[in-house]
């Protein structure tokens, strides 16, 4: 079964910059990938950035840098400030597509070591859901 | 996996009605656009309507204004597209899709270019 897995870290040197990567353990081919963010339970999410293998990339603030790192993952780095700016409880969603064999989904959020004074894990563990 | 599954479509006369509604799971429903797209016999896939992340934005293809409403539940994880007022042309297989088309454009628009999608509900609009 497909798996997606979602890393999130906040950047040492810039407290409101945050890291999202995502990747597809997979065999398929990733026709688009759609990277989301909310509120825990589903509440108040929007889109941050949308990939598309052959069209291009488009992101929307406040993501900042949105690129493919392999054929299977992507890496988003979000700067924040004010409303804009992630919080510790908010949720990240990556959603990997093959066509036409289906698309996948898997969430993640910053880890609670992740306080602002201490650097984040350099490789956190990734968080893996299959539906 | 993720799964949207459409349903509603039917045979019905011009000028008659239905609503299609499309039942998501596997994935954070409200936190992703969604849209109606359709293909006619013989011809390409064709954008119908979108709905923004929480209901608030909506757009139409000129063809639609009027007649159709997109709308969402997120506490039901479905989407809906009430057809009013249908016309022969309006005739097609209706699939449901994570996404918005203008992202990319709507040239050459396929299913491949959508997070997501249904199998498609076909319409029929005929007397």
């Known amino acids: 079964t497909p798996e997606v897995w979602v890393q999130v870290r906040m950047e040492a040197t810039e407290l409101s910059s945050f890291t999202i990567r995502c990747g597809f353990l997979g065999s398929g081919s990733i026709s688009l990938v759609t990277v989301s963010w909310g509120g825990p339970n589903g509440a108040g999410g929007t889109t941050l950035a949308v990939l598309h293998p052959e069209r291009g990339i488009r992101q929307w603030a406040p993501a900042r840098q949105a690129r493919w790192e392999t054929q299977s993952s992507i890496s988003l780095i979000l700067e924040g400030s004010g409303a804009s700016s992630p919080c510790a409880n908010t949720t990240f969603c990556c959603k990997f597509a093959s066509f036409p064999e289906g698309s996948w989904e898997a969430c993640g959020s910053l880890p609670p070591s992740s306080d602002p004074g201490l650097s984040a894990p350099p490789t956190p563990a990734p968080i893996l859901r299959a539906d | 996996e993720v799964q949207l599954v459409e349903s509603g479509g039917g045979l019905v006369q011009p000028g008659g009605s239905l609503r299609l509604s499309c039942a998501a799971s596997g994935f954070t429903f409200s936190y992703y656009d969604m849209s109606w797209v359709r293909q006619a016999p013989g011809k390409g896939l064709e954008w119908v309507s979108t709905?923004?992340?929480?209901?608030?934005?909506?757009s139409y293809v000129d063809s639609v204004k009027g007649r159709f409403t997109i709308s969402r539940d997120n506490s039901k994880n479905t989407l809906y597209l009430q057809m009013n007022s249908l016309r022969a042309e309006d005739t097609a297989v209706y699939y449901c899709v994570e996404g918005d088309p203008h992202n990319f454009g709507l040239e050459s628009l396929s299913l491949r270019d959508f997070g997501s999608w249904g199998q498609g509900t076909m319409v029929t609009v005929s007397s």
């Open positions: 709905i923004n992340s929480n209901g608030g934005r909506t």
